[in-house]
């Protein structure tokens, strides 16, 4: 016998309190496969979050965050946020990186500068704290009377910023 | 699934090297740090150093400068410790683990499962 | 520079509170994050609880963490102890955002 259930298409559900019929999903609520018991509530955006897609019978809500925040996690699940190049966000709030390391971004970690020496090869810009250094042409390769800037390479215990 | 896999830890005579590796899978290797960590028999756990295996920057614990060396590859998504001039106070289990990239400050979500680095002769 | 100091042992009868102290030795708690990981003899440390009072997936709620900034330190809370809980305890934080900073570690006994 086939379950009357599995009849009922998205955006309904099978009311068992009434001999199994599909009856839409109420007011903020949504099934998004057929064949449901129940259907979900859907995903409020409320606070840092904002609404980016509404809730429908037949699909959630979707939230991004305000201005100043950025999504984090499966869905948007969490707000965090957002530091200036040349920082990381931390415990203390936004943090200038440490010597050696950068950040191009508004979001995520400083990473470390680029070890310019791993590919044979020397530093034509030096790091800053939102760039990475730049690098040129191996030591060997620069003609007679050219240098290239050599900054304090980054291989060490940082210390504060 | 994530998942950081060592090996090459083994016995090391006094005065020798050694060259361990941390496998990586299940995420992108470019975008977060290996941290380096060791915990001496019976001892807590010590930082040895990290790197961003995306441009290969290093950082080193003060005691580990000059003896250890990171390197990352990134076609085999494997990072790399050498450490030379071995001592029987090296003797220890070796981590690799791997740091978020939410925060400046954060957790290590992911480790090795160690390997034994034993320096005796 | 910051230093993390836990007591080496902790006893608690099964089905007890078990807290477990983390403190901070210069700066104020809440200004850094701790985070806390169980190693068991033989096995690879795994978290906790991470940002001071967060739990990952598949850690029971018998765990939890806190701080108080008045003792300017952290805290491991194991509510309702069982014998599996017996291991070693280790607090984390940072010096600088690159630094990693270890307590010297508990060791919880269940008795």
């Known amino acids: 016998l086939q379950d009357p259930c599995s009849n009922c298409p998205a955006g309904t559900f099978c009311d068992n309190n009434r001999n199994q019929i599909c009856s839409p999903c109420p007011p903020n609520s949504f099934s998004s496969a057929g064949g449901q018991r129940t259907c979900d509530i859907c995903r409020q955006c409320k606070g840092v979050f904002r609404t980016r897609k509404e809730c429908s019978s037949t699909s959630n809500a979707e939230c991004d965050c305000t201005p100043g925040f950025h999504c984090l996690g499966a869905g948007c699940s969490m707000c965090e946020q957002d530091c200036k190049q040349g920082q990381e966000l931390t415990k203390k709030g936004c943090k200038d990186c440490c010597f050696g390391t950068f950040n191009d971004q508004k979001r995520g970690i400083c990473r470390p500068w680029t070890n310019c020496s791993l590919d044979g090869k020397s530093v034509l810009v030096n790091g800053t704290k939102e760039r990475d250094v730049v690098c040129g042409p191996s030591p060997a390769d620069l003609s007679p009377g050219a240098s290239s800037v050599t900054p304090p390479a980054p291989a060490r215990e940082p210390g504060h910023s | 699934e994530v998942q950081l896999v060592e090996s090459g830890g083994g016995l090391v005579q006094p005065g020798g090297s050694l060259r361990l590796s941390c496998a990586a899978s299940?995420?992108?290797?470019?975008?977060?740090?290996i941290y380096w960590v060791r915990q001496a028999p019976g001892k807590g756990l010590e930082w040895i150093g990290n790197?961003?295996?995306?441009?290969?920057?290093?950082f080193y614990g003060e005691k580990f400068m000059g003896r250890a060396t990171f390197s990352a590859d990134t076609s085999k998504n494997t990072a790399y410790l050498q450490m030379n001039s071995l001592r029987a106070e090296d003797t220890a289990v070796y981590y690799c683990?791997?740091?978020?990239?939410?925060?400046?400050?954060?957790?290590?979500?992911?480790w090795g499962q160690g390997t034994l680095v034993t320096v005796s002769s | 520079s910051v230093e993390l100091t836990q007591p080496p042992s902790v006893s608690v009868s099964p089905g007890q509170t078990a807290r477990i102290t983390c403190k901070l030795n210069?700066?104020?708690?809440?200004?850094?994050?701790v985070h806390w990981y169980q190693q068991k003899p033989g096995q690879a440390p795994v978290t906790m609880i991470y940002?001071?009072?967060?739990?990952p997936d598949g850690i029971p709620e018998r765990f939890s963490g806190s701080s108080d900034s008045s003792s300017n330190s952290a805290f491991l809370t194991i509510s309702g102890v069982q014998a599996e809980d017996e291991a070693d305890y280790y607090c984390?934080?940072?010096?600088?955002?690159?630094?990693?900073?270890f307590g010297g570690g508990t060791k919880l006994t269940v008795l």
């Open positions: 790197i961003w295996p995306g441009n290969g920057g290093t």
């Open positions: 683990a791997r740091r978020p990239d939410y925060s400046g400050d954060d957790y290590f979500d992911y």
């Open positions: 984390h934080s940072y010096d600088s955002t690159i630094t990693p900073v």
């Open positions: 940002r001071d009072d967060k739990r």
């Open positions: 299940g995420y992108t290797f470019t975008s977060y740090y």
């Open positions: 210069s700066g104020n708690i809440g200004s850094y994050y």
